[in-house]
Interface confidence: medium
């Protein structure tokens, strides 16, 4: 779109409230260490400037691109060099290189203090004293910790956050009302951030084609009654939206997402019968609802896929004429028939089909060569089915905590070089697949489990990319987006790993563990488990179980003692000695 003033165009489209919120998110995602007050000041300056451009689009600097305007504003921050080091060098560059430079410095694991939740009364007072500042602070704190959070969706979270405080701060029991809502928002927010991080990684590391293939598969499962043409149009628009958000173009992204929701709702009849309720909601809720809408029912009379993609004599002609369109049609037709498959499995099948056509369409008898292509799909389908079956059985047998521990041991043995906090975080999340997906019937297990695992393994990949320590992780993360999970599954114990030196300090615990929440206590124990495996990678399950049981008993005993700190000091020494003996350290 060629507008005289891009900033005026977006201000008018989005309205002042959303404009300010999105600029704050954009700035906080770029300058993650800046104090809240500094960001608010910058946002207010940009907003005032935008208003002058709305009044007169020909006013000075109103014709500048948003990247130029925002970049110039960010580069006025006085402490840029001291706070961000080499990121300050970005300011010496011209657009578009300057924006690319800022993007490259986004930190997935910023060195920021953990967000501690104040007392409910304190929060309610802050909310009532200055609602606007309170909500801005929420946007700022989430955005700086999650630099790829999907900005229009963060506006939706903020709306729910505000609604929770509006309702609960008037309730008789404020805490009982508010805390479960905040927990739910926190958990959903982390999940939303991780899902968006995978989309951005897909676009940035594997390109637009990879993202479009993912989108064709997912939208075809969700909208099986829609024409291929309609799905293609939605994919094109969705790709634009996510490319913009992942590229820091948050105003354009939010605007285009609203346009896409409008289009989908105007054309429900040719997209899905499940959209009616979503389309009656206000904009932010509508967009969220559409993104989460359940799969429509599959058309009853779908013909066999083999006719068009195997038996037809025109397969190579059609493939040659428009390769990506033909593969897109294959993916669409396969995905709409298989809501029971994960998106990554569907993409593996499409890749196998593409590889076969590339080989066979150059052969003497192409038809004979590709006639059995569907037979090659069988092992690809069975592998995730078997893996999910085995792991769900293990989960049902162990429960979530012990299942997480099994995965911690498994993954520490595969990639022991990875930092302990990363192994704990990733394995805990991998373990959540059990409670998230194993409850589902067979037909829903694979799309739930394998697509969730893709999201979690991407967390490992982006964290590892910041400080690479394992060639095996790098290989699995970079070779193929859709084969990441099979690649990690196939890793055996790393025989080249030199066990970590034993350090008693790692296994020294104090009375503060007793006041931790159950979740935080689990993390402490799981951190110890990872360290144990790093010291003794060849330890058996039985040995590790014995040590962990002793450890749990030790914590329980000392937390009940009168003099907790003395108990931890004395009993801790005994535990360390016993553990060393048990593991032969």
């Amino acid at each position: 779109d060629a507008h005289k003033s891009e900033v005026a165009h977006r201000f008018k489209d989005l309205g002042e409230e959303n404009f300010k919120a999105l600029v704050l998110i954009a700035f906080a995602q770029y300058l993650q260490q800046c104090p809240f007050e500094d960001h608010v000041k910058l946002v207010n300056e940009v907003t005032e400037f935008a208003k002058t451009c709305v009044a007169d689009e020909s006013a000075e600097n109103c014709d500048k691109s948003l990247h130029t305007l925002f970049g110039d504003k960010l580069c006025t921050v006085a402490t840029l060099r001291e706070t961000y080091g080499e990121m300050a060098d970005c300011c010496a560059k011209q657009e578009p290189e300057r924006n690319e430079c800022f993007l490259q410095h986004k930190d997935d694991n910023p060195n920021l203090p953990r967000l501690v939740r104040p007392e409910v009364d304190v929060m309610c007072t802050a909310f009532h004293d200055n609602e606007e500042t309170f909500l801005k602070k929420y946007l700022y704190e989430i955005a700086r910790r999650h630099p790829y959070f999907y900005a229009p969706e963060l506006l939706f979270f903020a709306k729910r956050y505000k609604a929770a405080f509006t309702e609960c701060c008037q309730a008789a029991d404020k805490a009982a009302c508010l805390l479960p809502k905040l927990d739910e928002l926190r958990d959903e927010g982390k999940a939303s951030s991780a899902k968006q991080r995978l989309k951005c990684a897909s676009l940035q590391k594997f390109g637009e084609r990879a993202f479009k293939a993912w989108a064709v598969a997912r939208l075809s499962q969700r909208f099986p009654k829609a024409e291929f043409a309609e799905v293609s149009k939605l994919v094109t628009d969705l790709t634009k939206v996510h490319t913009e958000c992942c590229h820091g173009d948050l105003l354009e992204c939010a605007d285009d997402r609203a346009d896409l929701a409008k289009y989908i709702c105007e054309n429900q009849d040719s997209i899905s019968s499940k959209l009616k309720e979503c389309c009656e909601k206000p904009l932010l809720e509508k967009s969220h609802c559409i993104a989460e809408v359940e799969n429509d029912e599959m058309p009853a009379d779908l013909p066999s896929l083999a006719a068009d993609f195997v038996e037809s004599k025109d397969v190579c002609k059609n493939y040659a004429e428009a390769k990506d369109v033909f593969l897109g049609m294959f993916l669409y037709e396969y995905a709409r028939r298989h809501p029971d498959y994960s998106v990554v499995l569907l993409l593996r099948l499409a890749k196998t089909y593409e590889t076969t056509l590339e080989k066979c369409c150059a052969a003497a008898d192409p038809h004979e060569c590709y006639a059995k292509v569907f037979d090659e799909f069988k092992p690809l389908v069975e592998e995730p089915q078997n893996l999910i079956k085995q792991n769900c059985e293990l989960f049902e047998q162990l429960g979530e905590y012990k299942f997480q521990n099994a995965l911690l041991v498994r993954y520490t043995k595969k990639v022991p070089q990875v930092s302990t906090p990363t192994l704990v975080e990733v394995s805990r999340n991998l373990g959540k697949v059990g409670s998230k997906c194993c409850k589902h019937p067979e037909a829903k297990r694979m799309p739930c489990a394998e697509d969730y695992l893709s999201v979690v393994l991407n967390q490992l990949c982006v964290l590892h990319e910041k400080t690479p320590v394992s060639d095996r992780v790098t290989k699995c993360c970079t070779e193929s987006l859709v084969n990441r999970r099979p690649c990690f599954s196939a890793l055996e114990v790393d025989e080249t790993y030199v066990p970590k030196e034993f350090n008693a300090e790692t296994f020294t615990f104090h009375a503060d563990i007793c006041t931790l929440s159950e979740k935080e206590r689990q993390i402490k124990k799981q951190t110890a488990l990872v360290e144990l495996v790093k010291h003794k990678p060849k330890a058996t399950k039985e040995q590790l179980k014995a040590v962990m049981d002793d450890f749990a008993a030790f914590v329980e005993k000392c937390c009940k003692a009168d003099d907790k700190e003395t108990c931890f000091a004395e009993e801790g020494k005994k535990l360390v000695a016993a553990s060393q003996a048990a593991l032969g350290l």
Partner: antibody
């Protein structure tokens, strides 16, 4: 190369019917949206109707809704326009045009048109 | 009655630049990036010049360019040549239908 050849036009009395055909060649017909666009003598272009790739969804200008029916036969690579209850204002040169893989976007290829005259 | 508004005629000398406007509403031109432009030479079928607001169709010279601001789209022809004399139509997607402009006749003086 892409070819679209319209046929079936002619002189018809008001209230009468005609069926236009458009034979397509040089591309995979079933991949593309197809359109009918008309042009009255000395006037501009007017969009008449559109049909999706499989023929499941059809769209019409208000001026022809309820009287005209667009359809396609992908096996025969042919687009049709059944025109009933014709009026003098339907007199025009009728073009068949190929759209894109999706509904929106330009009409990249056009036939030479077939003349329809409605007169008593 | 055309839904999109174009000037009936424009003119320019060889080598010069002309711009043809196409005014619509937020439901058509202003909605999404779905404006296209066509050239119709006398006695010929229309030919696609531009699609998706500003993308040139295959084989179209870069003398033809287009853009959009708000609810108005524009086609610019630079380095005018005598063979550019023709009728030019804009079109836009609108809620499941397509709408055309009334057309603009370009005269090369």
């Amino acid at each position: 190369q892409v070819q679209l050849v319209e046929s079936g036009g002619g002189l018809v009395q008001p209230g009468g019917s005609l069926r236009l055909s458009c034979a397509a060649s040089g591309f995979t017909f079933s991949y593309y949206w197809m359109y009918w666009v008309r042009q009255a003598p000395g006037k501009g272009l007017e969009w008449v109707s559109a049909i999706d790739t499989r023929g499941g969804s059809t769209y019409y200008a208000d001026s022809v809704k309820g009287r005209f029916t667009i359809s396609r036969d992908n096996a025969k690579n042919t687009l049709y326009l059944q025109m009933n209850s014709l009026k003098p204002e339907d007199t025009a040169l009728y073009y068949c045009a190929r759209g894109g893989l999706v509904r929106v976007g330009g009409l990249g290829s056009w036939g030479q048109g077939t003349q329809v005259t409605v007169s008593s | 009655q055309a839904v999109l508004t174009q000037p009936p005629s424009v003119s320019g000398s060889p080598g010069k630049t002309v711009t043809i406007s196409c005014a619509g509403t937020s439901s058509d031109v202003g909605y999404g990036n779905y404006v296209s432009w066509y050239q119709q030479l006398p006695g010929m079928a229309p030919k696609l010049l531009i699609y998706d607001v500003s993308k040139r169709a295959s084989g179209i010279t870069d003398r033809f360019s287009a853009s959009k601001s708000g609810n108005t789209a524009s086609l610019t022809i630079s380095g005018l040549q005598s063979e550019d004399e023709a009728d030019y139509y804009c079109a836009s997607y609108r809620s499941g239908t397509t709408v055309f402009g009334g057309g603009t006749h370009l005269t090369v003086l």
